[in-house]
């Protein structure tokens, strides 16, 4: 049964009963507020495999253990996020361990698990078998991993019965408890999911499978569920729904809200059913469930009742997905998240029109403006003190604010200040100034020359490709050297490359301050004769992939306050030769007589050219009378584990509790001080752990109802 | 052809809970949101509850509380659990398949009684 | 809720005479109003569905207009079979409402 949409479970335990017969929850699940301890061992609830939107868990009383509620919950697909979270754990003042042994796949989004005092078996868990992006996850504030002393199955018998992987260097046993293992695929599923036995599922599957390779035995879908089978896309006459399932028009039809009327029911376009017709398009008549374009702009005015609305994650952007034009003010305040370039886009990318300012401070996770990528006119009907419209402070990694080569933007009224952005070139923001009309309206302290672009290599110089050398796995590019007017200004070379399909990528695509960046770099010295070109060998690259190539001098970037010159290339693309492809897949040969064998198989999934032909080989094969010698039903031991070498940890003996070393001197001393820049750290942290505690309230507390 | 049956009516003592149950027949039950409507003697037509396509119910402020609509898509059945009856419950109780804002048919049950009485 | 009021409550005609029933809703309701047939006991039939809309199956004498918080059904030449009573019907906002009734009988 698919229950839905979204369900709150609070103050009395025996909701839980709501679940009782869900196998899918279509939208989100919050169990919350419980205050009176209770015994849960009662309630289970099986059935569940799969949550679409995100799982909230926020101070439930007496609740030890998820595992026992949902022994088989496998994917949460994160379709929408709570706070730019799938899996919020927090509060929760006796659970002692996640124990979510099955779950395989969160889908879209990250994890927070926060002030939970009795939390353990948070260390035995490799999130990345389970998530994309390990790196925004938020655990914090539980139970400290030294007290816990958290211990795999078997470990104590030196009988383990988990698998290893490496986790910060760290190679250890996984698992959930103290009795189940984190489950992992053999590697020759590559990214498919696999059964309890090992076998691999069908590549539609997601999480887990009931028999191997059958798109109709899958426990979730990789894409999308229809009539009992996992498809690729939706098939004809159906429709895609809440992003996992297809449905016809009659159950789009069907779709009822409280907040809206029945005329502003749920439309049909593009394949999907929808809550409303995305923007560009309106609907097609009165009493129509189709989307057309809209004849010149059709505008989708979102108003905050608050006048300013402030974008802190990526939950508060997905409120003006489609909006077009905002009437109040917009303030950007994204400290971190997960791939949020591509997230702000998503939901922001429409907006035209901002009636009142722009205001972006503290926002250390972009890096470009480009996210508002249809953004066009600034309207300045209210203005920040100062009479201010574009106001940008303190983004510490902000380098980009549009392509002004291909935007247009007005600024119809107000001035434009900026300050403390370390990375942004004040050429850029001058640029700005005569693309928006507002030059002259600044006085000179709204543009600081001074600690905007302090930290950046300004450039102003093109470096030139001199050859390139490509073979199967490895491109060599050499250029000219770049010759500031100081040689002692230029210090390395950095060389930006990704895989690049179509030539269509700019230097800040999917390019966020949190880690998620689409270009690998690599640092290159200058070479120490002066006459030698530099250059690089990149290498472990695939064969028979157009890669874009770019690479841009490091230079010192203040010289008594005035900025020097730096230099980049323009964006280089060349494609790899081609080389052998990997292996057929999925070889089957079968015999139809007693003189023929038949024999199939699949593309390889590296061709690593363009396929021409197969060769197939045979040999007759002796009987190897090993295979009868073997014993397969034994195991050969195998050594369990690394023994104690007889040092004893310094901290669980010393005295004195403060062991750091300072200085040249080795010893217990006092700890050193923290700098500005870790105390500004842990002061954002906290103000950022207040921002989540807030938003968390914000969403949970609701008036009783009369 | 497109029918809605309906059983479970009878008599209830109040405080008591009934549950009726409409059986679809001629047309993809799982694609159309299904409703309630009751009928007091001698008294006009009153919607009481609804569950869409997704399961999201809707009620009205008179049963809220103390009736729970439901429905069971691989039975083609749709059910409403009535706890904590009073007097005022009484009424013919038609299980309907209403048209919607873009189109469709109506489809009514033949009705069923329910009588809360001591 | 949106509150639907009909008049008159009852309505006096004689057969082959025009009948105008009205229903007013207390907010706007855009066309999601709908007119039904009830005989004493059967369920109801729709008649016309969306303020104007008639359906196949159900004779043309029986029309609607209106729109927002104003509607009309018009019967144009009472049959016989055509005294019953009429209820009208919002879809627009949950909860769903109806009106209390318009009883047509025999003048």
């Known amino acids: 049964e698919i229950c839905g949409p979204g369900i709150d479970i609070r103050n009395d335990y025996q909701q839980l009963k709501r679940l009782e017969n869900c196998t899918v929850i279509e939208g989100y699940l919050h169990i919350l507020l419980i205050s009176k301890a209770e015994d849960y061992r009662s309630y289970r609830f099986p059935k569940l495999t799969v949550i679409t939107e995100y799982l909230l868990l926020f101070r439930v009383a007496g609740l030890e253990s998820l595992g026992d509620l949902f022994p088989n919950l496998t994917v949460i697909r994160g379709w929408k996020l709570f706070y730019n979270y799938a899996l919020v754990i927090f509060e929760m003042t006796n659970l002692k361990d996640i124990g979510l042994y099955n779950l395989r796949n969160i889908t879209r989004g990250a994890i927070r698990i926060e002030k939970n005092a009795d939390l353990c078996y948070l260390s035995t868990v490799d999130w990345s078998l389970i998530l994309d992006a390990v790196s925004n996850n938020y655990i914090v504030g539980n139970k400290p991993p030294k007290e816990c002393g958290d211990l795999c199955p078997g470990t104590m018998e030196e009988k383990p019965m988990c698998e290893k992987t490496t986790i910060n260097n760290e190679y250890n046993y996984r698992c959930w408890t103290t009795n189940r293992c984190q489950k992992m695929c053999p590697s020759t599923c590559g990214k498919r999911a696999c059964t309890e036995n090992n076998e691999c599922c069908h590549p539609e599957c997601l999480g887990s499978c009931s028999a191997p390779d059958n798109d109709t035995a899958c426990v979730a879908c990789r894409h999308y569920y229809y009539a009992g089978v996992c498809v690729p896309a939706c098939p004809p006459n159906t429709y895609r729904f809440e992003g996992w399932r297809c449905v016809d028009r009659d159950f789009c039809a069907n779709i009822l809200s409280a907040e809206s009327s029945d005329s502003e029911g749920f439309v049909i376009h593009d394949g999907e059913c929808m809550q409303e017709c995305p923007s560009g398009f309106i609907r097609n008549g009165s009493q129509s469930m189709y989307c057309i374009p809209c004849e010149g702009p059709c505008p989708k005015v979102c108003e905050e009742e608050k006048k300013t609305k402030t974008i802190d994650s990526v939950t508060s952007a997905q409120m003006l997905q489609g909006c077009t034009i905002f009437k109040g003010n917009l303030l950007i305040n994204i400290r971190r998240g997960n791939n949020i370039a591509s997230e702000l886009e998503n939901f922001m990318g429409l907006i035209e029109v901002v009636t009142g300012y722009v205001k972006i401070r503290h926002s250390h996770a972009l890096v470009s403006l480009s996210f508002l990528k249809n953004l066009r006119l600034i309207l300045g009907e209210e203005q920040l003190e100062g009479n201010y419209s574009f106001y940008v402070l303190d983004n510490q990694n902000l380098q980009q604010l549009w392509d002004w080569d291909h935007r247009n933007l007005t600024i119809k009224a107000g001035k434009m200040y900026f300050a403390f952005n370390p990375k942004l070139c004040v050429s850029e923001i001058y640029r700005m100034e005569e693309v928006t009309g507002t030059k002259g309206r600044q006085s000179k302290g709204d543009i600081n020359t001074r600690n905007n672009g302090e930290r950046a290599s300004c450039e102003s110089d093109v470096l030139h490709f001199t050859s390139t050398t490509t073979s199967k796995n490895r491109i060599i590019i050499t250029w000219h050297r770049y010759r500031p007017p100081d040689y002692r200004d230029l210090i390395s070379f950095t060389v930006y490359y990704k895989e690049a399909p179509f030539k269509n990528v700019t230097e800040y695509d999917g390019q966020d301050a949190c880690g998620s960046n689409s270009w690998n770099m690599v640092d290159v010295d200058l070479p120490p004769n002066k006459d030698v070109e530099p250059g690089i060998l990149l290498h472990g690259l695939k064969p028979w992939t157009q890669y874009a190539v770019y690479v841009k001098a490091v230079t010192l970037t203040m010289v008594e306050n005035d900025h020097i010159r730096g230099a980049k290339s323009e964006i280089l693309y060349i494609r790899t030769n081609a080389s052998v492809p990997s292996i057929p897949l999925d070889v089957l040969s079968a015999s139809n007589s007693s003189s023929q064998l038949i024999v199939k198989w699949n593309p390889p999934s590296l061709p690593n050219g363009n396929l021409s032909y197969y060769i197939v080989r045979w040999q007759r094969q002796p009987q190897d009378g090993y295979l009868y010698r073997h014993n397969y039903c034994s195991k050969d031991k195998i050594p369990i584990r690394k023994y104690a070498d007889g040092t004893i940890d310094i901290e669980e003996v010393t005295e004195n509790p403060k062991t750091e070393v300072c200085g040249g001197e080795k010893g217990p001393c006092c700890a050193c001080p923290k700098t500005e820049a870790e105390k500004q750290a842990e002061k954002e942290e906290a103000e950022y752990r207040k921002v989540f505690e807030n938003f968390l309230h914000n969403s949970i507390f609701v008036p009783r109802p009369e | 052809e497109v029918q809605l049956v309906q059983s479970g009516g009878g008599l209830v003592k109040p405080g008591g809970s009934l549950r009726l149950s409409c059986a679809a027949s001629g047309f993809t039950f799982s694609s159309f949101a299904m409703h309630w409507v009751r009928q007091a003697p001698g008294k006009g037509l009153e919607w009481i509850s609804v569950?869409?396509?997704?399961?999201?119910?809707y009620y009205a402020d008179s049963v809220k509380g103390r009736f729970t609509i439901s429905r069971d898509n691989a039975k083609n059945s749709l059910y409403l659990q009535m706890n904590s009856l009073r007097a005022e419950d009484t009424a013919v109780y038609y299980c309907a398949r209403l048209g919607n804002f873009y189109y469709g048919h109506d489809v009514w049950g033949q009705g069923t009684t329910v009588t809360v009485s001591s | 809720e949106i509150v639907l009021t009909q008049s008159p409550g009852t309505l006096s005609v004689s057969p082959g005479e025009r009948a105008t029933l009205s229903c007013r809703a207390s907010?706007?309701?855009?066309?999601?109003l709908h007119w039904y047939q009830q005989k004493p006991g059967q369920a109801p039939r729709l008649l016309i569905k969306h303020a104007s809309q008639s359906l196949s199956g159900i004779p043309d004498r029986f029309s609607g207009s209106g729109s927002g918080t104003d509607f009309t059904l018009t019967i144009s030449r009472l049959e016989p079979e055509d005294f019953a009573v009429y209820y009208c019907?919002?879809?627009?906002?949950?909860?769903?409402?109806f009106g209390q009734g318009t009883k047509v009988e025999i003048k």
């Open positions: 569950i869409d396509t997704r399961g999201a119910t």
């Open positions: 019907h919002q879809s627009s906002r949950l909860p769903h409402t």
């Open positions: 907010q706007s309701i855009g066309s999601s």
